[in-house]
């Protein structure tokens, strides 16, 4: 055994850049840190064979296979991959091992399987084998979190069914609105499943996986802040838990809380009551209402009552599928170039949906924020004052929802010219959309007056890379007109610009550009 | 290099519940069929094989412990987490992390135990 | 649970000495055991794995034979460094399990 050279097998995976095909390499490109694949002599095989720790990886990523070697002398080396012979350089490393690699990039279906390395040396012969499979994300999933009382404790256990197996935290923050924000100083997370501490002010839970983070809110009402303009409003699916927390404080200990759903008390068993003395020695009391798996019957208007403060509502919504309301008509702007803008959406969901933005076929991330009447926004600003089609994508577990607009920025046209042998076509991608004139430059007319009406074909035509009105319009050659130049311009509220063609040339032949204003 | 260090309390009373963090460098949790054992060891005792979790977040758990054992691993901080649940004075002992390569493919995975230890982290239950 | 059980539980022997530490699985297992030395106040080190294959950076001296049920540690020739606790580990089957130990001691 201390005869074996000693191997060290490495998986490096990269950020992806570049977009080829598998390829042998004696310098990988620069890349994140090597891990090593434990590679290990595989036990009762014919000849000296290591085999890798499987590597799985996501589809689209780049890797390379490495091979570290500490032995004397000259190594030499072949890779096979699906009966394939694939060139190999071995190279030296500082501490004077020998380094073969196997650059994958952009992995793929059939750039998934063995790939064997055999490798020479003065004193042996061996093999390596890697096998490198893509993982199926198709499996994983992202469950948002919910919460259980937990068994003889007054605690909350916070549950995401999700795989792989995610990370759940806890969100605790003690201010008021903004400064409740993620990366807020007033924000304390606890990366535990338990919750004992349930007087905080605002309460949520967070499940994390490969797939993202999802999280839930303790919905509460706060019997000491001033009840929103319109009730709150709490969407459910039938067999999902409900969780409402009602918080008071008080100076002192003498008052109650109780809920009633629809000016009936809650069953026992489907409460239960919390107190504790903050710092200044005020009583605060918290009383949950919580019903394992609700039905269609547990709607309704769910009142927290108080001895001390005056009784706050919520109204809470079973339904059986969940849904996206939002009109989706699609919506039409147009803008100057320089002015601030950002296109909008307002919807009411449940569950809390996935949003992309969309243009010219890549996606923006999309932010969303609650409102005071339950409905949720989300905004696009980051559109760089590019005009065309502009898609909102949203989805949830039950439904999906689509809405287009178009941006026009306002601005006046500019003219690119074309000529072939029987016409000379001129386009503009001004907005509003602009009209055309041709004239005829001649002896007689050496300022280009004389205007030419026959022949004269305009239109407008979607250029689909950005979903934007491209106007053109195209002169048909006639005998009148040959060998003089013309003169197209595309004109709008915001200018005037022109392009002169000399016609019966064989190709474009801008001759001068007018910008008029 | 392949590391896995072990840190958590030294001092754990009575019925409390023992969180022990594995962290891992030089390897990953993600791109590698990959899992992490927890063993521990009570004094002048053999050792006992606890749990052990995977990269594809599948795990195992030692028979007579399943009840109290939870583990858990977060691959952006490359940690692996062990929790234990109402311990006792015959839970002190030295409790280590190992690394486990899995080999194979197609998921048709092979293990060779452990190959690479953490140092160990020494942890005393008493009130 | 597939038990294992180590023989002797302890040894005493001198430098040179052949040295055969036995593991016995109450099921087969295949080739699928390991062998671990432990020093005091150390971490265990793994010596071979599948019954036969050498770790990486073991010293010959080492070798481990068996399959099934019945399973065997040779030290061929005892070595100072060699004075430990060994322990098998079964990892054929979840839960995976280790034997009781064989401590080496110095005669």
């Known amino acids: 055994n201390q005869d074996l050279p000693v191997i060290k097998c490495v998986l490096i995976n990269h950020k992806n850049n570049d977009s080829s095909v598998g390829k042998s390499s004696s310098y990988p490109m620069v890349s994140e840190s090597p891990e090593d694949l434990g590679c290990a002599l595989r036990p009762q095989s014919s000849g000296t064979v290591y085999e890798a720790a499987a590597v799985e990886v996501d589809v689209s990523a780049s890797i390379t296979l490495q091979v570290l070697v500490d032995a004397p002398g000259n190594i030499s080396c072949l890779w096979v991959f699906k009966h394939s012979s694939l060139n190999c350089q071995p190279h030296f490393d500082l501490q004077n091992r020998g380094v073969v690699s196997m650059v994958i990039l952009k992995m793929t279906e059939t750039q998934a399987g063995e790939y064997l390395l055999f490798i020479q040396s003065e004193a042996t012969n061996y093999t390596i084998l890697f096998t490198v499979s893509i993982r199926n994300t198709l499996l994983y999933t992202l469950r948002r979190p919910y919460f259980r009382k937990m068994e003889n404790q007054d605690a909350l256990v916070c549950i995401s069914e999700s795989v792989p197996e995610p990370i759940v935290e806890w969100v605790l923050c003690d201010s008021q609105g903004e400064s409740c924000k993620e990366e807020s100083p007033a924000v304390v997370k606890k990366e535990e499943k338990v919750l004992h501490e349930l007087f905080g002010t605002d309460i949520r839970c967070c499940a994390r996986n490969e797939l993202g983070r999802e999280c839930t809110r303790l919905f509460t009402i706060d019997l000491n802040q001033t009840p929103q303009t319109t009730l709150p409003q709490l969407f459910l699916k039938v067999g999902e838990p409900l969780w409402i927390r009602c918080k008071a404080v008080h100076v002192n200990h003498g008052f109650g809380l109780t809920w009633e759903l629809e000016n009936k008390a809650l069953e026992e068993g489907n409460y239960f009551e919390m107190s504790t003395y903050s710092t200044n020695r005020t009583m605060i009391r918290i009383l949950f209402a919580f019903v394992s798996s609700v039905a269609r019957n547990d709607t309704g208007y769910y009142t927290c009552s108080s001895s001390k403060h005056p009784s706050q509502s919520a109204l809470v919504t079973i339904v059986e599928k969940g849904f996206i309301n939002a009109t989706n008509s699609s919506e039409d702007y147009e803008i100057d170039q320089y002015e601030e803008f950002c296109f909008s959406v307002r919807f009411k969901a449940y569950p809390q949906i996935r949003c992309t933005w969309t243009f010219s076929r890549k996606s923006f991330p999309c932010e969303q924020k609650g409102l005071d009447n339950g409905y949720s926004i989300s905004k696009f600003c980051n559109h760089k004052h590019q005009p065309g089609e502009y898609i909102f994508h949203a989805e949830n577990d039950d439904a999906q929802f689509t809405k287009m607009f178009t941006l026009n920025i306002r601005r006046k046209p500019q003219v690119l010219a074309e000529a072939s042998a029987s016409q000379a076509s001129c386009f503009s991608d001004g907005y509003p959309l602009p009209s055309w004139t041709w004239k005829k430059c001649s002896d007689k007319s050496p300022n280009c007056t004389e205007e030419i009406t026959e022949g004269v074909w305009n239109r407008k035509a979607n250029r689909k890379v950005f979903g934007q009105w491209v106007s053109s319009s195209t002169l048909n050659m006639s005998e009148a007109i040959k060998g003089f130049l013309v003169k197209c311009c595309a004109y709008n509220s915001l200018g005037t610009s022109c392009e002169t063609i000399l016609l019966n040339s064989p190709g474009p032949f801008p001759f001068i550009q007018d910008n008029i204003s | 290099q392949v590391t896995l260090k072990e840190s958590g309390p030294v001092l754990v009373k009575p019925t409390e519940t023992l969180t022990l963090t594995c962290t891992v460098s030089g390897f990953s949790l993600i791109n590698a069929r990959m899992g992490v054992s927890w063993i521990r060891q009570p004094p002048g005792k053999a050792l006992e094989w606890l749990a052990h979790?995977?990269?594809?977040?599948?795990?195992s758990y030692r028979t007579s412990l399943k009840s109290r054992l939870t583990i858990s691993k977060d691959t952006s901080k490359s940690q692996v987490v062990l929790t234990m649940t109402n311990m006792d004075p015959v839970d002190t002992a030295t409790y280590y992390c190992?690394?486990?390569?899995?080999?194979?493919?197609?998921?048709?995975?092979?293990?060779?135990?452990?190959?690479?230890w953490g140092q160990g982290t020494t942890v005393t239950v008493s009130s | 649970d597939i038990q294992m059980t180590q023989s002797p539980s302890s040894l005493s022997a001198s430098l040179g000495d052949r040295v055969t530490i036995t593991c016995r699985a109450s099921?087969?297992?295949?080739?699928?055991l390991g062998w671990y030395q432990q020093k005091p106040g150390k971490a265990p080190k793994r010596l071979i794995y599948?019954?036969?294959t050498l770790q990486s950076g073991v010293p010959s001296r080492f070798s481990g034979s068996g399959s099934g049920t019945e399973f065997t540690l040779t030290i061929s020739s005892l070595q100072p460094e060699d004075f430990a606790t060994y322990y098998c580990?079964?990892?054929?089957?979840?839960?995976?399990?280790f034997g009781q130990g064989t401590k080496v001691e110095i005669k």
């Open positions: 580990l079964q990892h054929n089957n979840f839960p995976w399990t």
């Open positions: 099921q087969g297992i295949r080739n699928d």
């Open positions: 599948a019954s036969s």
């Open positions: 979790i995977f990269s594809n977040a599948e795990k």
């Open positions: 190992a690394r486990i390569p899995g080999y194979g493919g197609n998921g048709d995975y092979h293990y060779y135990g452990m190959d690479v």
